[in-house]
């Protein structure tokens, strides 16, 4: 489970916390009495903010209110203004801008083309029985499995736009129903948030920067996880997304078949027909369950055909029966001739890559699937790089002016909603939420943007990314436009629903508090950031995937007890913090659990020992290795042989954060551990408290 911060009233400084502390008590204790408590003593303690009881046991106090890690540091703007450029600089800048615009349009074109090819690839990969497989198989009828497929695919392709486009292509190819696609879209929303979390790891060198950056990145994760946690069961029960989007799409009155608008296909067809062409007649025959079509290849071979009013007739007993002497032959077994029925004589082959390969449909489809995915990802990356280079320098100034400034009272509350619009707009421009949020992450880390302001920007980004899905829908052929547009709208309304759940009322902004809690833990135990990433984006989805494939019985058998334990822990946690007196004394805190179950300190010792031998070798390599080492072992002093780690060590020495005085502790076990009375981890692996 993700670390769960205190769910009570938000305090001005929620990072002043005790990790692994007991439940909060309403009355303040006598400090002198508290220091004399034994391990098993249960007594009222000071009301303070808490992180989950199973998080780290080490206690830190931020130096002063001025040095609050969640406060923004002073920033210096960089970037040459237009007015400050000389004539040569202005001309160069202008032509660079034109060049970037051309490149941008080019990559956008190939992006749309790759969507078209992706649709063809799914038709080929799906093969003759694809429709039945996707509509009947457990993979598509199990929403939980759909969800984790969405997460894993998006984690692998590093873009929700790409995985959403895949789903849209599958829907437009009729390989997937809208209902089955919705959980995949939800999973894609979760998966895309890994990108900016990875970006946040790059700021591991500076503890306070890392705290802010990691929290800023994981606010996206928590929003998506919480949204799915609530909305997936709601969707499974009510199908509200499917119903709403169906009503909207039907109100557009799209025509089916040939008369439907091809829109982007008009400009993409000249390119896509050079890659692959499908025999539309075979596709329609398969759709109508034509048995003869099952042995036919979907890849179009002959484009130029001569239509003659004759047809091959295998029933000619001998060549003497030929209707036309010149159009008569044998294949050694049967005699053929042309009858007075339309017959297409193949004259010229199609001019596409796969025309002469004679590969099975599955092979062609797989090749195209991989290539179109690569092009999709590549185009998205290049679009972002181009836009990134355009925005570089001026982005900090623009963001600080537009985002961190509140409207005057009484309209201050509207600022967040403007931030949502800005986030949506920016993502609409860059065509990728992961890119926009990844750009935000270092800005949060260095203090350009507060987490409170980054949160609505991220939510807006989730809305903005749906425009890519709408683009994908518009690239679908006319008769598939409705279904693909519907799935794009499902993505849109899912994000809207999530915003309505976790934004309008300040109390419901759980993702901020959860992200800050995780930021604090990861700043203290930096290896936990990697652990979190692996658990939430790989292990949990893969476990659910495995259990789902094993069947509903296995999934329920394992899932129900796990969910029950989680709910039990949460309820107990809530009671401990709200009304501990209703609980038996033993359950008023977590001391009844062994230390490894309620603190990260023992785990830290294990990780430190495990990475001990790796640290010295790794740190001597380069700055990147050093940062990776420091992330894992949380110990810059272990890297003395590396100049970069010495620099880090020196920088940290001037910023050491004092450990809280034992009299403020609400738990003697933790108090003693901090003072060294209780055996903790090996001191050799603990170089510094922070």
């Amino acid at each position: 489970m993700a670390p769960w911060p205190e769910l009570g009233d938000a305090q001005p400084n929620p990072d002043k916390y005790l990790e692994g502390a007991a439940g909060q008590q309403p009355t303040a204790p006598d400090k002198s009495k508290e220091t004399n408590k034994t391990d098993n003593t249960e007594a009222p303690v000071t009301k303070i903010e808490l992180l989950p009881s199973y998080s780290t046991a080490t206690l830190i106090d931020e130096p002063t209110e001025v040095d609050d890690p969640w406060n923004l540091p002073t920033l210096q703007d960089s970037g040459i203004k237009w007015s400050e450029r000389d004539t040569k600089g202005k001309i160069l800048c202008f032509f660079q801008g034109i060049g970037r615009l051309i490149l941008l349009l080019g990559f956008l074109y190939f992006f749309v083309c790759s969507l078209d090819i992706l649709s063809s690839a799914f038709q080929l990969v799906g093969g003759k029985m694809a429709g039945q497989f996707f509509s009947n198989s457990s993979i598509m009828s199990n929403p939980l499995l759909g969800l984790v497929i969405g997460v894993l695919v998006t984690v692998l392709v590093q873009s929700s736009s790409t995985s959403t486009s895949i789903v849209v292509s599958m829907v437009s190819s009729s390989l997937l129903t809208v209902r089955a696609a919705i959980p995949i879209i939800m999973g894609a929303n979760i998966g895309t948030s890994i990108t900016n979390t990875i970006v946040a790891l790059m700021q591991v060198g500076d503890r306070s920067e890392f705290r802010r950056a990691f929290a800023g990145a994981t606010v996206h994760d928590f929003f998506n996880w919480l949204s799915v946690l609530v909305l997936l069961p709601v969707e499974v029960a009510t199908h509200y997304l499917e119903i709403i989007t169906q009503l909207i799409v039907e109100s557009f009155h799209f025509k089916n078949g040939e008369d439907a608008p091809d829109l982007l296909k008009v400009i993409t067809k000249p390119f896509t027909k050079l890659i692959v062409q499908l025999d539309k007649k075979v596709i329609s025959q398969i759709a109508m369950n034509d048995e003869k079509a099952k042995n036919k290849s979907l890849v179009k071979i002959w484009c130029k055909t001569f239509t003659n009013k004759t047809q091959i007739n295998v029933t000619v007993p001998s060549t003497a029966n030929c209707t036309s002497p010149s159009l008569c032959w044998t294949d050694g077994i049967q005699n053929w001739t042309m009858k007075n029925v339309t017959y297409k004589e193949n004259i010229a082959k199609c001019q596409h890559i796969f025309v002469n390969f004679h590969l099975p449909d599955l092979a062609v489809g797989t090749i195209l699937l991989i290539l179109s995915l690569l092009v999709l990802c590549g185009c998205l990356i290049m679009i972002v790089k181009i836009l990134g280079s355009v925005l570089k320098g001026q982005v900090a100034t623009v963001i600080k002016k537009t985002i961190n400034t509140d409207f005057p009272f009484p309209f201050a509350w509207l600022t967040g909603y403007l931030a949502i619009l800005v986030g949506a707009g920016m993502t609409f421009i860059v065509q990728s939420s992961s890119v926009f949020t990844s750009a935000l992450t270092p800005l949060i880390g260095i203090g350009v943007i507060t987490i409170e302001r980054a949160y609505p920007l991220t939510l807006g980004s989730n809305i903005g990314t749906t425009t890519t899905a709408i683009l994908a829908a518009l690239a679908s052929p006319g008769n598939a436009l409705r279904s693909s547009l519907q799935i794009a709208l499902c993505h849109f309304f899912f994000n809207i629903s999530g915003i309505l759940l976790w934004y309008p009322i300040p109390f419901t902004r759980l993702p901020i508090r959860m992200a800050k809690g995780l930021g604090n833990i990861s700043a203290k135990y930096r290896w936990f950031a990697v652990f979190y990433l692996i658990i939430f984006f790989f292990l949990i989805p893969l476990t659910v995937f495995g259990l789902s494939l094993a069947g509903w019985r296995v999934l329920v058998g394992v899932g129900v007890p796990v969910v029950f334990i989680i709910i039990l822990v949460l309820c107990l946690r809530l009671l401990q913090s709200r009304c501990p007196r209703v609980l038996p004394k033993k359950l008023q805190n977590w001391n009844f659990l062994p230390l490894w179950m309620r603190s990260l300190k023992p785990w830290d010792a294990v990780v430190s020992k495990f990475t001990g031998c790796f640290q010295m070798r790794c740190c001597c390599c380069c700055r990147v290795c050093c940062r990776a080492c420091c992330l894992l072992c949380d110990c810059p002093k272990c890297c003395r042989c590396s100049k970069c780690c010495e620099d880090l060590e020196e920088a940290q020495e001037g910023q050491d954060v004092p450990v809280k005085a034992p009299e403020t502790f609400d738990n003697i076990t933790i108090s003693r551990e901090a003072q060294g009375e209780v055996p903790a981890s090996d001191s050799k692996t603990e170089c510094t408290a922070l």
Epitope: N295, S297, S318, P325, S326, D331, G332, Q334, N346, H358
Partner: antibody, heavy 120, light 107 residues
């Protein structure tokens, strides 16, 4: 790519029989006719017969009827040619070749050939 | 059975020369004629089908023509790699029959 891989060379005694296999890959086996053609040393090509794998319809050249049997196994995409009552004049290289069913494109791909030597 | 006669049985030419091989069927075969190339020690390869349609990947220097009973294969500019035996085949009626072959050599 399109491949027709034939079995190895055989040395047989007169009166015995030989079975040559031809494994197809890189195309839809059932969409093609598999023909067998032989070439005696220093001679031209002689068509022996063929089979349509998806319905097992066969046809043989008159002078081979009763002596040759052509079969096909769809599951393994393999065609077989069995020639019985071997004589010394049956010493030749035996080729399998494919022909697109319902097309007049002739034998567009051939196997590498199997040398059958008949000697006492 | 339709008899297919090929001429000449062999010919010697120089690189760059134009070569014409003829094939005569004992009866009208329409355009149901194919041409094959067999290099020494190799299996035959299809060059031309339906009398004049060049098979995929066949160089443009190879052209086929004719209908009825008389057919020709022309190599417009002979290359060293064209050293082979060329066979014509009729597929108007069963059994399929081949010509005896024309061996092309380079001087």
């Amino acid at each position: 790519q399109v491949q027709l891989v034939q079995s190895g060379a055989e040395v047989k005694k007169p009166g015995s029989s030989v079975k040559v296999s031809c494994k197809a890959s890189g195309f839809f086996f059932t969409e093609y006719i598999i023909h067998w053609v032989r070439q005696a040393p220093g001679q031209g090509l002689e068509w022996m017969g063929g089979i349509i794998p998806n319905n097992d319809v066969t046809n043989y050249k008159q002078n081979f009827r009763g002596r040759v049997t052509i079969t096909a196994d769809e599951s393994t995409s393999t065609a077989y040619m069995e020639l019985s009552s071997l004589r010394s004049e049956d010493t030749a290289v035996y080729y399998c070749a494919r022909w697109r069913n319902a097309y007049y494109s002739a034998m567009d791909s051939w196997g590498q050939g199997t040398t059958v030597t008949v000697s006492s | 059975d339709i008899q297919v006669t090929q001429s000449p049985s062999s010919l010697s030419t120089s690189v760059g020369d134009r070569v014409t091989i003829t094939c005569t069927a004992s009866q009208d075969v329409g355009t149901a004629v194919a041409w094959y190339q067999q290099k020494p020690g190799k299996s035959p390869k299809l060059l031309i089908y339906w009398a004049s349609t060049r098979h995929t990947g066949v160089p443009e220097r190879f052209t086929g023509s004719g209908s009825g009973t008389d057919f020709t294969l022309t190599i417009s500019s002979v290359q060293p790699e064209d050293v082979a035996t060329y066979f014509c085949q009729q597929y108007r009626t069963s059994p399929l029959t081949f010509g005896v072959g024309t061996k092309v050599e380079i001087k």
